[in-house]
Each structure stands twice: as C-alpha cells, then as structure tokens.
Interface confidence: low
C-alpha cells in the first residue's frame, strides 16, 4: 500500500516555478508520469495560436502548481496545498475565458491538459484555503 508523500521536484517542465521545492505525490511513480504528461501538454500549448499572453502568463504556473502541488508543511500528514480559488476563478472567467472555452470543447486538448475545476477548491474564507498556493494574479489581490 502506498500513501501520498512529499518529495523534492526533480523535473524540468515546471522548474522555473517550483525549483526543487517539496511537492506532494501520490505514488513513487507519479512524478515522472506527470512530468511526461505536462511536457506533452506544454509542447501542444507552445504550438497553439489560441493562447494569449495575458492568459499564458498565469495559466502556465497555475497548471504547474496544480500538477505538482507544494506540500503543506503545516500538516502532520503528507498533504498537498490547493490552488487559491479566487485566482482560479479569475483565470477561468477573465484572463483565460476564451482559452478555457476552446480547451473544454476540444477533446484532443482535454486529453493532454488537466484543467483545475475551481468549484472543487476550498472557499476563500475557509480554514482549508488559508495556506493555498497563490500565483500572484493582480486582480485577485
């Protein structure tokens, strides 16, 4: 039986956002598998003409932190930190609205790209959201 655990990020695709910080993984094999999948997703994004600069500036780090969430150092058991719901919603509904609509209607993109469901994230004022991962989207401040 394998529990989730925390390990240093060893990948390349998200290194500029995560560095070698500790991320939460759900099995020994998971980090390598996710690295392969997110690399393929980023390759696809790079060739897309549908991604605006204002969206990609925050969508790329957001996807990295969703794929490789920081470990919650305040928890006594290995636990991932969530993305912040307010930023997630601004990304989906404002900065990347067109891109999300396109992505969700395109099966090929959905196969490669795992988009966060903002409704699954803790409410901003809840205790669970106190330690959420903030990307730094200006409109959320």
């Amino acid at each position: 039986e394998e529990d989730g655990f925390c390990q240093p990020y060893r990948g390349i695709a998200c290194a500029r956002f995560i560095g070698n910080r500790t991320v939460y993984m759900e099995s020994l094999h998971m980090q390598g598998e996710i690295e392969n999948q997110i690399t393929a997703a980023f390759t696809m994004i790079g060739t897309s003409s549908h991604l605006s600069d204002k969206c990609s500036q925050f969508a790329i780090p957001s996807l990295c932190h969703y794929a490789f969430p920081y470990c919650d150092e305040t928890s006594s058991v290995p636990k991932p930190r969530d993305l912040c719901r307010d930023e997630c919603e601004i990304l989906e509904n404002v900065l990347c609205q067109t891109e999300y609509i396109f992505a969700r209607s395109n099966p090929m993109i959905l196969m490669r790209l795992k988009l966060p469901n903002c409704e699954d994230l803790p409410q901003p004022e809840s205790p669970e959201a106190a330690n959420c991962i903030r990307i730094g989207i200006p409109m959320a401040d």
């Epitope: 039986e1 989730g4 099995s27």
Partner: nanobody, 111 residues
C-alpha cells in the same frame, strides 16, 4: 468514514472487456491516492492503475494500453475500463483510497 464498494467483476473470455466501478460513500478528497490494485491467487497485491486529483494517471506496465482508469467526482465513483483481457488478468480487484480498501471484486478471464 468513507466506505468503498466495488462492482463489475465477473467471468469473461480472453480478449473481452469489463468495467469495474468503485462507489465511495462520501466525496473522496484530493488527499487520497485513488487507484485499483489486484491480487491473483498465491501472489502479492499489486498496483494496477492510479489517478490523482488533476486526472494524472499511472498504469502498471502489464496493463498499459489495455486498461483505463477514470473518476467521476459528481458520482463519487472510480472506474477501471479493462479491454483485451488476458488469463493473467484473473484476480480480485480492489479499490484503494490511501489507507481505505474496498471488499474486492473477482475478475476471471477464461475460455
């Protein structure tokens, strides 16, 4: 406490398909490592497939390209679609969420 209940097992011919389901009594939070394990007679329990909160997947080499794991959060249900089944896939299949286990469902592949 969350309870896991598997279904969908049975007898199938080699090359056939089955879909296993694992219904959870509550929402399975992203803190769980959700997946399928199997145990063949006289063998150790082994990881078959796993899915993380973002839909990132892991498959054992022996099932890659044949099995597909998926999760429906709205139904609190985990699935394992098994195609091109082989005799060596015969086992009891268990749903797993961190330290929680279902009771298992028997899959028998035989002609």
């Amino acid at each position: 406490e969350v309870q896991l209940v598997e279904s969908g097992g049975g007898l199938v011919q080699p090359g056939g398909s089955l879909r296993l389901s694992c219904a959870a009594s509550h929402y399975i939070s992203r803190f769980y490592a959700v997946g399928w394990y199997r145990q063949a007679p006289g063998k150790q329990r082994e990881l078959v497939a796993r899915i993380s909160s973002g839909g990132w997947t892991y498959y054992a080499d022996s099932v890659k390209g044949r099995f597909t794991i998926s999760i429906d959060n709205s139904k609190n249900t985990l699935y394992l679609q098994m195609n091109s089944l082989r005799a060596e896939d015969t086992a009891v299949y268990y749903c797993n969420a961190r330290n929680l286990w279902g009771q298992g469902t028997l899959v028998t592949v035989s002609s």
